[in-house]
């Protein structure tokens, strides 16, 4: 820092209060309005213009530097002159029904150009035709039900699956493995139409012509499909598209429930195996294969003409240099690209980030600096597979793994307006609990009460009484590369729906053209008080992480969850007591490692309490132990067949990218083990994974010991 630049020595708590008080709901509302006037699809000129606008505004807000980081990555777009659709054809090949080519535009947006029609990004081209099989949610267990129980072979069939429960890419992967030649994805009213609520524009429900867009990749953390492991810069070696990571091999297309009705009402074959296969349409939900009665000679045909194209994307990276530890980075990042207007996803998050930057900038202009450096990121191409964040992290991996303290994600601020939802590393549990005790609840009936109180009442932890639920990190968002690949402590927070009374997975209008500013302003958060609360939580976490003298991480909380996860995986294994005996499978090493970790974490905390915080070297040593603890759970070899998922305690579920799985290596080795052809080999892999987990926990414990 230049000598002329002042640094006000103001008590930290006062600065935190100043930072939080500076955050304004009205500003978030204004920013959201500004960000949602037009579509901002990744790789388009409009999204580049928005990147430059954000760069300019962050500079005005007072950040030290704001740069654009560009990459040339594989994206996917529909063919403008050759639209994608699905048809029912008769025995002569005549198209007797065609699905719609676009969503009816919402009021006020009829003349907006470049609204991308519904499509599943990265679908290959193709025009398959065949009999239809209804596969429910296309979960692993749904295909098990069809193949093993109903004895239905999906080979050579087109499957129709309803959106929900799991990431759409997993649905496509499951369909491919089952031998399907095409996939139709649709939004069922049972999942995307809440009872008693009107369709948009009169309410927040999905109309019959609404369709969810989304990518169908299975990247497993690779980033750009052509440059796995390395940034997609100008000198990058690019794979041939035939060798690209994670691309689907069969055509896939999404439709709304009006069009789905036309297909499903004709279905014959077997009745749905049980009530969990029935949705909300007035159709029998027969699984097929094929149509019934007068339609029995008709087939389904897909017409997919999308193109994959290497396209330039732009991240915006802003820096607020730390006054004391400029080489320690706290990152707040969220994406900017949207499928259409992005009313919720992502701009409700981007507007919050914008206001957080403005508040930090205001403090900086008054002479304050954070202790540690704060990096702010507006990621591009998240919707195409977390590409912007992953490419940037690949480019900066060496620095990040040495200097990265924490990453706080900032996608959609709301998916409902019921209560807070937090997913984070156990290291952040105490940070989140302490922060929410200091913040006001925005909820009706909780006036004058803390956010912690309303959150705890509405979403109590299933394990720890008196504490709110905090979930495991999975994936499907931009924290993935930071947490799962690099081992940087990460967290995310947003306002959510009541999961007990609402069974739909995402909000009904997710990734549709109806995700507009008006959706938020009219139905979800008219006063923007929930957005403000999310800004306070995200901003407050960043503030504490960047400004606390001792990092606000509690390693004892990791010890508690490690024991819980070890118990859970042991119980799964114990469903096979005979095999465990036959193959001498023991979890003793893992339980011993967890016990050791628990004891060492406890001793570490005792030393931390006695630490002379005025000794910068001793302080830095212990802070580094806390910072590097998450890193210690990284295995450089990665998980089997998933080299970019390297965290041994957590990984995205192999069956649902959105969900987190604990001890994923052991879990996957045990999954469906009773069906394995070679049980000796299968149980050998279980033993190998137990040993890896035990070693990793022991090694992580070792990093918390006194350094000498």
């Amino acid at each position: 820092k230049s000598p002329s630049e002042p640094t006000n020595i103001v008590p930290q708590h006062d600065m935190k209060k100043a930072f939080l008080d500076e955050l304004k709901a009205e500003n978030i509302k204004r920013f959201l309005y500004n960000f949602t006037r037009l579509p901002h699809l990744a790789g388009t000129e409009r999204n580049f213009q928005l990147a430059k606008q954000i760069q300019s505004q962050w500079k005005e807000f007072g950040l030290d530097s704001v740069e654009l980081a560009h990459y040339d990555v594989l994206l996917s777009y529909p063919n403008k002159t050759h639209p994608n659709y699905i048809s029912i054809i008769d025995e002569d090949g005549n198209e007797i029904f065609n699905s719609s080519l676009f969503e009816p535009p919402p009021p006020g947006y009829e003349n907006v150009s470049d609204v991308v029609p519904p499509f599943n990004a990265f679908s290959p081209q193709g025009m398959p035709e065949g009999d239809l099989v209804y596969v429910n949610y296309a979960q692993t267990e749904d295909f098990f039900k069809l193949e093993r129980d109903l004895k239905i072979n999906c080979s050579g069939k087109i499957v129709i699956a309803r959106y929900g429960k799991i990431f759409r890419g997993n649905k496509v992967k499951n369909a491919q493995l089952a031998g399907a030649k095409g996939v139709i994805l649709y939004s069922d009213p049972a999942d995307y139409f809440a009872p008693g609520v009107k369709s948009y524009p009169d309410g927040w429900n999905l109309p019959g012509g609404g369709v969810q867009r989304g990518n169908i990749l299975n990247l497993n953390g690779a980033g750009d499909p052509l440059t796995p492991g390395y940034p997609a810069n100008e000198y990058a070696y690019r794979r041939e598209v035939t060798e690209a990571v994670g691309l689907p091999s069969i055509p896939v297309h999404p439709i709304g429930y009006n069009d789905a009705q036309k297909l499903l009402e004709k279905m014959g074959g077997a009745a749905p195996p049980d009530s969990s296969w029935r949705g909300g349409l007035q159709v029998p939900y027969n699984v097929g294969p094929g149509f019934t009665g007068n339609s029995s000679t008709q087939k389904v045909k897909m017409h997919i003409h999308s193109n994959n194209k290497v396209t330039r994307i732009y991240n915006v990276i802003g820096t607020l240099r730390g006054a004391v530890e400029p080489d320690r980075y706290v990152i707040l990042g969220g994406h900017r690209d949207s499928w259409v207007f992005g009313g919720i996803d992502p701009q409700s998050g981007a507007a919050v980030v914008h206001e957080i930057v403005r508040s930090f900038g205001t403090l900086k202009k008054e002479g304050w600096r954070p202790r540690r450096t704060i990096l702010f990121a507006s990621w591009d191409a998240e919707e195409f597979g977390l590409l912007g964040s992953t490419e940037w992290a690949e480019e900066n991996s060496r620095v990040l793994q040495e200097r990265g303290v924490a990453y706080i994600n900032a996608d959609s601020s709301i998916e409902g307006n019921y209560t807070l939802r937090v997913d984070c590393t156990p290291l952040m549990y105490s940070l989140v609990y302490n922060l929410t005790k200091e913040l006001q609840s925005p909820d009706e009936g909780f006036e004058g009460k803390s956010l912690y109180e309303s959150w705890n009442e509405k979403s109590p932890s299933p394990e720890f009484s008196g504490m709110p639920r905090i979930s495991k990190l999975g994936s499907g968002n931009d924290f993935e590369v930071f947490f799962q690949r690099l081992g940087i402590s990460s967290g995310r927070a947003r306002y959510t729906k009541n999961w007990e009374t609402s069974k739909f997975r995402s909000y009904p209008l997710y990734h549709s053209v109806y995700e507009t500013y008006e959706l938020v302003e009219k139905f979800y958060d008219p006063t923007f008080k929930y957005h403000l609360t999310v800004a306070q939580v995200r901003g407050g976490m960043v503030f504490e992480l960047a400004n606390s003298i001792v990092l606000p991480f509690d390693c004892r909380d990791y010890a508690v969850v490690l024991r819980k996860y070890a118990d859970k995986i042991y119980n799964i294994s114990m469903k096979h007591p005979q095999e465990m005996k036959t193959y001498s499978v023991s979890f003793d090493s893992l339980f011993s490692a967890v016990k050791n970790f628990t004891e060492i974490a406890s001793k570490f905390n005792e030393r931390l309490e006695d630490l002379d915080k005025k000794n910068p070297i001793l302080l830095r040593i212990m802070n580094d132990q806390l910072m590097f603890l998450e890193r210690a759970f990284i295995d450089p070899l990665g998980l089997p067949d998933r080299p970019f998922y390297r965290h041994i305690i957590y990984a995205p579920s192999s069956h649902n990218k959105y969900a987190g799985e604990s001890f994923p290596g052991i879990y996957d080795a045990l999954f469906d083990i009773e069906s394995k052809v070679d049980p000796s080999k299968a149980w050998g892999e279980v033993k190998r994974q137990i040993s890896i987990a035990a070693f990793t926990v022991q090694a992580a414990a070792g990093t918390l010991r006194e350094v000498a």
Epitope: E141, K145, R148, D149, K151, G269, A271, D274, S275, S296
Partner: antibody, heavy 115, light 107 residues
Framework: QVQLVQSGAEVKKPGASVKVSCKAS????????MHWVRQAPGQRLEWMGN????????TYSQKFQGRVTITVDKSASTAYMELSSLRSEDTAVYYC????????WGQGTLVTVSS | DIQLTQSPSFLSASVGDRVTITCRAS??????LDWYQQKPGKAPKLLIY???TLHSGVPSRFSGSGSGTEFTLTISSLQPEDFATYYC?????????FGQGTKLEIK
């Protein structure tokens, strides 16, 4: 090998309830639909309902709706069928059958309803 | 409800005979139909599923055919252990229903 072992014969009074159990072994219990079927003396087989042991999803025959409840205990690999408000015409042999195509059957449980 | 009607209801035949049992559905069930064999005092056993696929362990003298509303079970050469009652059953729509049965007796 697959085995379904049902609980023993029951004699019940009209208006009472009966709960028949079906213990499965030799296969992955959660993978196969469990049906319940009954057969009155000299009559055809009559389907009552089914359950997906993995998620507890059930479907009941309209004829028995409100009177029959099918449940499972996954940890014990056991399915249960409870029939309430018994009447004399409910006297029958009750079978559990595993698999969508009724691949494997229990030995049957005779339920006699008599005052 | 879909009605299944089997014919004949009774059938007398001799060892070595070829016999055919028919099952008619009151509406189109595609190929969602199974055949079972039941002996007195015993539980039924699955013979054929999806109208024509032989269940594992079932002798190849049993075969099934048909789709829509007309189905047949054929035993190519009767063996002494085949004398029993045979049922068809549809799973195209709820409630799942069985035919009334065909009792195959020794002539």
């Amino acid at each position: 090998q697959v085995q379904l072992v049902q609980s023993g014969a029951e004699v019940k009074k009209p208006g009472a309830s009966v709960k028949v159990s079906c213990k499965a072994s030799g296969y992955t219990f959660t993978e196969y639909t469990m049906h319940w079927v009954r057969q009155a003396p000299g009559q055809r087989l009559e389907w009552m309902g089914n359950i997906n042991p993995n998620n507890g999803g059930t479907t009941y025959s309209q004829k028995f709706q409100g009177r029959v409840t099918i449940t499972v205990d996954k940890s014990a690999s056991t399915a249960y069928m409870e029939l309430s408000s018994l009447r004399s015409e409910d006297t029958a042999v009750y079978y559990c059958a595993a698999g969508w195509n009724f691949d494997y059957w229990g030995q049957g449980t005779l339920v006699t309803v008599s005052s | 409800d879909i009605q299944l009607t089997q014919s004949p209801s009774f059938l007398s035949a001799s060892v070595g005979d070829r016999v055919t049992i028919t099952c008619r559905a009151s509406q189109d069930v595609g190929t969602a139909l199974d055949w079972y064999q039941q002996k007195p005092g015993k539980a039924p056993k699955l013979l054929i599923y999806w109208a024509s696929t032989l269940h594992s362990g079932v002798p190849s003298r049993f075969s099934g055919s048909g789709s829509g509303t007309e189905f047949t079970l054929t035993i190519s050469s009767l063996q002494p252990e085949d004398f029993a009652t045979y049922y068809c059953q549809q799973y195209n729509s709820y409630p799942l229903t069985f035919g009334q049965g065909t009792k195959l007796e020794i002539k």
